[in-house]
Amino acid sequence: APVRSLNCTLRDSQQKSLVMSGPYELKALHLQGQDMEQQVVFSMSFVQGEESNDKIPVALGLKEKNLYLSCVLKDDKPTLQLESVDPKNYPKKKMEKRFVFNKIEINNKLEFESAQFPNWYISTSQAENMPVFLGGTKGGQDITDFTMQFVSS
């Protein structure tokens, strides 16, 4: 069976949108009006992994691009990157673990925990126009809560 996917956008809990910054980086900033068209549309795929009532394993690809968010060690630190893949082979049900995020739903907000690096989350800074990154703390200065907006195909 083919992997199930849906198109969506994500905003952090401060309502910052995610946009491309160069070919392999996302940044978070407040957008208004026509600028909203700049925001990244994700293809969220529902992949194999440990699932529970509030936790669902997903992969986050960029719609119509051969890029997926992935988590790797760089200089011994878990790091978020955009990784180029072969479109003939992706998305797939059994994604490599570096591509998998546990989508956790709490009080109508979403967290995206790295399956590869438990307790590390997709994060944004309080500051405007800063890169989206993988953070190892929840409830601190950095933002780990998101909302999801569905986008028609």
Epitope: A1, R4, L6, F46, E51, N53, I56, M148
Partner: nanobody
Amino acid sequence: EVQLLESGGGLVQPGGSLRLSCAASGFTFEDYQMGWVRQAPGKGLEWVSSISAMGNRTYYADSVKGRFTISRDDSKNTLYLQMNSLRAEDTAVYYCAENLVRVLLNKWMFDYWGQGTLVTVSS
């Protein structure tokens, strides 16, 4: 043509049990995650349970966990829901859904569903 035919519903007293079945045809049953959703009178659809392709993973809504058991028999192209310790609030039409994927706690995607079978829990 995909067909899903549920059966096994009926009237049961609180604390009683029922076993629902869903006979599937028109697709390669064993390849797909399957599940059950329900609709209580005057309410919206509610996800109940899912079972992965190959049946090695099962998932349940909190409201039925420990009381309901989902299973499948790929040789018979049939999905089951064993419902024990039934309560009045379990009264609903139960639908079998093909390629069921949960998106959020109260949102899911599926390709096909059956016509449903009514379960009434009342004394």
